[in-house]
């Protein structure tokens, strides 16, 4: 639903994009997820702050908890507990990394109309939850959990050894959170609330980097984060249980790890409770190709977890790394032994495979040159999941449904020819019992969001259908996108090009690559975004593609662990390949070209302005890795193995920007990079400038004093002026 | 003047339910929580429960628990409290009360008005 | 769940003379947040309901004589009659909503000397 193209007569009266635009995101769309609190209801902020309970079978709707209480405590977030008495108020919120944030709670009382006045919770609180049934709560403060078996009782202390940087208790130290559990959490209460399992990490001997944060005190302050690089102790994990009940009768007590995993460095990757008295735990060795799923029992003679051998389910990869970009996580049946899984099937595409007593026995449920990207719920009979088959586009995501109560099982694309020109890109949200159903679309067109039948899959309302961004971009004049492919040796390579609006072949057009490029990544999406890239093509008259090389996912292990092994080499090849595939198109002007990227992908744009191929004229890395010995040890070993002599050093040290600093020398680069990036470190840019410096090579360099990774807020908006600037400097465009 | 006013008296047999109801006027229903407190003959005022009419939760004192349900009907401005399983320490005057509901965080509002009362026998 | 006891259990003062009743609690009723203390006083006459006269230890409810007054904080509170009249014949009762159960002290009757 993009709007349509106009006859020349309207042209005069359309407008191109603006930075302006962009920076104000005056073009930002809305998305809507229910929050489901049974399987008929669900909770949403209304555009006043109320926040609103909706019965889908009755059609009522009342406020449950009124703005004016949560004004009265300036709360940003909330959480009803399941027995709908309380709900918690979360304001105060201050970031910390990714995920992790620190905050104030207030517990509301629905029944009394009024907040929780006794034994009020500390602040600040890194993390709390309700418990699945009635009102228990569980918190981490200070590196600590405690719980509460009600929200006016005093708290109970779970845990005492909790030390900042030390032992973080049901909370992930920075390298968990980032990227291994991608939570602020490492706590989980079983379904029905009896137990609570919790992860404790061990940073002790982990070294730390430390930055300086300037703030506006006379002397910076220093940052200490226990972050292990690659090839560096890391920290250690162990898992832990509570009955909740009668949290002092035994106490917590470990779960243990299988043997095959403890024999050397291991790491704990997911907990997923299967009933109140049966976990599943999936461990992976430190060298990341084998992972063991352990399935475990609570013994109530000894008031202990077992986890026999024949429970341990181990999946192994002898191409690459064990999973995608995480291993996957098993979604249990109605039977609590059997669950569903996805993995690569013998033909090296991730797909459903249903295991019953072993994996070598599994069933595989999916199979296709295309991958099965997600299960969202398994139902008595029915599996829901997402993937990219439909047509053959890796890029789309549609929702399936399998009937499991059936033989043979029947397949039905939910999705697939709902709104097919607006929506080929879709992820769900799934009510209790997927009695209901919501399916937010991404794109192509203007995002979508609607209620659906989980019996029929009949549509029953639009929740947000962004008709107030249609309506301001009528008179924009958007780029043309268009997805296509490249076969090159054996290769697909999937681009999306952004094109200007009145593009015409027979024309040259200066060309941008943006790219990411990290393993399991992917770029090529058929999603609807109006953003900096949409600026350069409408307004500048850019052409700008985007490439998905070896190394990105969703299109088989060959392409996906084609990388393995060898960072840097294979994701930089494919751009270039491309860059020469689009100048034979013929409507690049090779004498402008550029590429760009943000992380892992100014890692790729630097290497790529180093590769001597006299492709680029210039280019810009934001916060590039220059070199993994720099960068997390669970990220870069899963693909790069370790940093030894008897490992995979010589790559390491092959592999990085610095090395390649003589290559610069003909290229006009900008390296920009925050000072207070806990990710990749300003360590990274401050030894390419180094390097280049010594190499006597001129460049241009940006940082944004105490930001992050991710350079938000105002440095935002002078990060995107700066690049432009130095684009259109580079293309010759005026200003 | 507000107004909360309860159903009449109810003599009743050990083990079976009573249910007393307090309709209450010139006032905004849904800005004030229903209370309801006991007074068995010589004893101190007890509470038994409390119910906020917006969303029709109830919270009861541990004591009853199982055995008494408040409930309400907006649409009649009235609020009920059901008591099962009777017993003889059961007799008591019932009262319904009103209690403002605090939205904000610093508020927090007593009980200040009450229903005259309904006295429940419970007597073989 | 917070107790309240109330002394004496009865008092007989002269019509004029001040009457004065003392209610303590189990736990403090000082939230600290806003300073305030969630106790009130009800009077209760025979055969009529409880009717509110202070709230917030020491705030009077609208239409209650000045002769009443509450004062105290924390977990010692003082219901206090400067000048008994006869209409103010009744069982005293404090009452705590700082936190769940409500809990009401066991009454402190008042009668003419």
């Known amino acids: 639903l993009r709007p349509p193209r106009v006859h020349n007569s309207e042209e005069n009266t359309m407008r191109a994009l603006t930075l302006k635009d962009i920076l104000n995101g005056t073009f930002s769309y809305k998305t809507f997820f229910p929050n489901w609190i049974s399987g008929q209801e669900y909770l949403h902020q209304s555009a006043d702050n109320n926040i609103v309970l909706y019965n889908i079978e009755t059609g009522q709707s009342y406020t449950i908890l009124s703005n004016r209480t949560m004004k009265s405590v300036n709360a940003s977030n909330y959480g009803l507990s399941p027995d709908r008495q309380f709900v918690y108020l979360e304001s105060d919120y201050s970031k910390l990394w990714r995920y992790s944030y620190t905050a104030t709670y207030y517990i509301y009382d629905l029944s009394n109309g009024e907040f929780v006045r006794g034994n009020e919770l500390p602040r600040p609180i890194q993390y709390l939850c309700w418990s699945p049934v009635g009102s228990k709560l569980a918190y981490v403060y200070q590196n600590n959990i405690y719980l509460k078996q009600r929200p006016g009782d005093p708290p109970f202390q779970i845990t005492f050894n909790g030390r900042e940087n030390k032992i973080f208790n049901g909370i992930p130290d920075w390298v968990y959170e980032e990227e291994m559990l991608a939570t602020k959490y490492a706590l989980w209460w079983s379904p029905n609330g009896k137990f609570l399992a919790y992860a404790e990490f061990n940073d002790t001997d982990i070294p730390v980097i430390a930055y300086s944060y300037y703030g506006d005190e006379q002397y910076p302050r220093t940052i200490n984060i226990p972050y292990p690089k690659a090839g560096a102790k890391n920290p250690f994990v162990r898992i832990f249980i509570i009955d909740t009940t009668y949290p002092a009768y035994v106490g917590p007590q470990e779960v243990p790890v299988p043997a095959m995993i403890a024999s050397s460095d291991y790491y704990f990757s997911w907990l997923t409770w299967v009933t109140d008295e049966r976990v599943c735990l999936q461990w992976l060795k430190r060298v990341q190709n084998v992972s063991v799923l352990s399935i475990c029992d609570f013994r109530e003679d000894w008031q202990t977890w077992d986890c026999p051998k024949t429970q341990e389910h181990i999946e192994e990869s002898r191409t690459g790394w064990a999973g995608g970009f995480f291993v996957s996580t098993p979604v249990f049946s109605y039977d609590a032994i059997s669950y569903y899984k996805i993995f690569s099937d013998k033909d090296g595409y991730k797909h459903i495979h249903y295991i019953k007593d072993t994996v070598e026995n599994a069933i595989q449920i999916t199979s296709g040159k295309w991958e099965a990207i997600n299960i969202f719920r398994v139902t008595q009979d029915s599996l829901f999941y997402s993937s990219n088959e439909f047509e053959d586009y890796p890029g789309r995501r549609n929702i399936y449904r399998i009937s499991i109560g059936s033989y043979p099982p029947s397949k039905k694309c939910v999705t697939c020819h709902l709104r097919k020109e607006r929506c080929q890109y879709y992820t769900a949200s799934f009510s209790d019992y997927a009695k209901y159903y919501a399916l937010v679309c991404y794109g192509p067109g203007i995002p979508i969001s609607t209620l659906h039948d989980g019996r029929t899959d009949q549509e029953i309302k639009i929740l947000e259908e962004n008709k107030e961004l249609e309506n301001a971009l009528k008179n924009i004049q958007l780029p043309k996108e268009e997805i296509k492919k490249l076969e090159v040796d054996e290769i697909t390579l999937w681009y999306k090009m952004i094109l200007p609006p009145q593009f015409d072949r027979s024309k040259k057009y200066p060309l941008l690559i943006q790219v990411y490029g990290g393993p399991c990544s992917q770029s090529v999406r058929s999603v609807f975004a109006v953003n900096w890239i949409s600026y350069l093509a409408s307004k500048e008259g850019m052409v700008i593609a985007l490439v998905d090389g070896r190394g990105t996912a969703f299109q088989g292990d060959k392409l996906l662990y084609a990388v393995y092994r060898k960072l840097g080499v294979y994701e930089v090849e494919d751009q270039i390949t491309a860059v020469r595939k689009f100048i034979e198109m013929g409507f690049i002007d090779e004498k402008r070209i550029a590429i760009w990227g943000w992380s892992y992908g100014g890692y790729v744009s630097s290497l790529a302005l180093a590769s001597g191929t006299g492709l680029f004229k210039c280019g810009i890395a934001v916060a590039p890795v220059s070199s993994w010995e720099y960068y997390a040890s669970v990220y870069t070993e899963r693909f790069m193995g370790l940093p030894t002599k008897d490992d995979n050093l010589e790559h390491y040290k092959n592999s990085t920007v610095m090395a390649r600093a003589e290559y610069f020398r003909n290229v006009d680069y900008l390296l920009i990079h925050g000072t207070a990036d806990d990710n990749v470190h300003f360590q990274n840019s401050a030894q390419i400038a180094k390097a280049l410096v010594n190499a006597q090579v001129d460049f241009q360099a940006m940082w944004y004093s105490d930001q992050n990774h991710g350079l938000s807020g105002l440095s935002t908006n002078h990060l995107y002026t700066h690049m432009t600037h130095f684009l259109k400097q580079c293309f010759s465009l005026s200003d | 003047q507000v107004q909360l006013v309860q159903s009449g008296a109810e003599v009743k047999k050990p083990g079976a339910s009573v249910k007393v109801s307090c309709k209450t006027s010139?006032?905004?229903?849904?800005?004030?929580?229903i209370h309801w407190v006991r007074q068995a003959p010589g004893q101190r005022l007890e509470w038994i429960g409390g119910?906020?009419?917006?969303?029709?939760?109830?919270n009861y004192n541990q004591k009853f628990k199982g055995r008494v349900t408040i409930t309400v009907d907006t649409s009649a401005s009235t609020a009920y409290m059901e008591l099962s399983s009777l017993r003889s320490e059961d007799t008591a005057v019932y009262y319904c009360a009103r209690r403002r509901i605090a939205y904000g965080y610093d508020e927090g509002h007593a009980m200040d008005y009450w229903g005259q009362g309904t006295l429940v026998t419970v007597s073989s | 769940d917070i107790v309240m006891t109330q002394s004496p259990d009865s008092l007989a003062v002269s019509l004029g003379e001040r009457a004065t009743i003392n209610c303590k609690s189990s736990q403090s009723l000082l939230y600290s947040r806003n300073q305030k203390n969630y106790l009130a006083w009800y009077q209760q006459k025979p055969g009529q309901p409880p009717k509110l006269l202070i709230f917030?230890?020491?705030t009077r409810e609208s239409g209650v004589p000045d002769r009443f007054s509450g004062s105290g904080f924390g977990t010692d509170f003082t219901l206090t009659i400067s000048s008994l009249q006869a209409e103010d014949v009744a069982v005293y009762y404090c009452q705590q909503y700082f936190s769940y159960p409500l809990t009401f002290g066991q009454g402190t009757k008042v009668e003419i000397k």
């Open positions: 010139r006032y905004t229903f849904t800005e004030y929580t």
């Open positions: 119910i906020n009419p917006n969303n029709g939760i109830p």
């Open positions: 917030w230890a020491s």
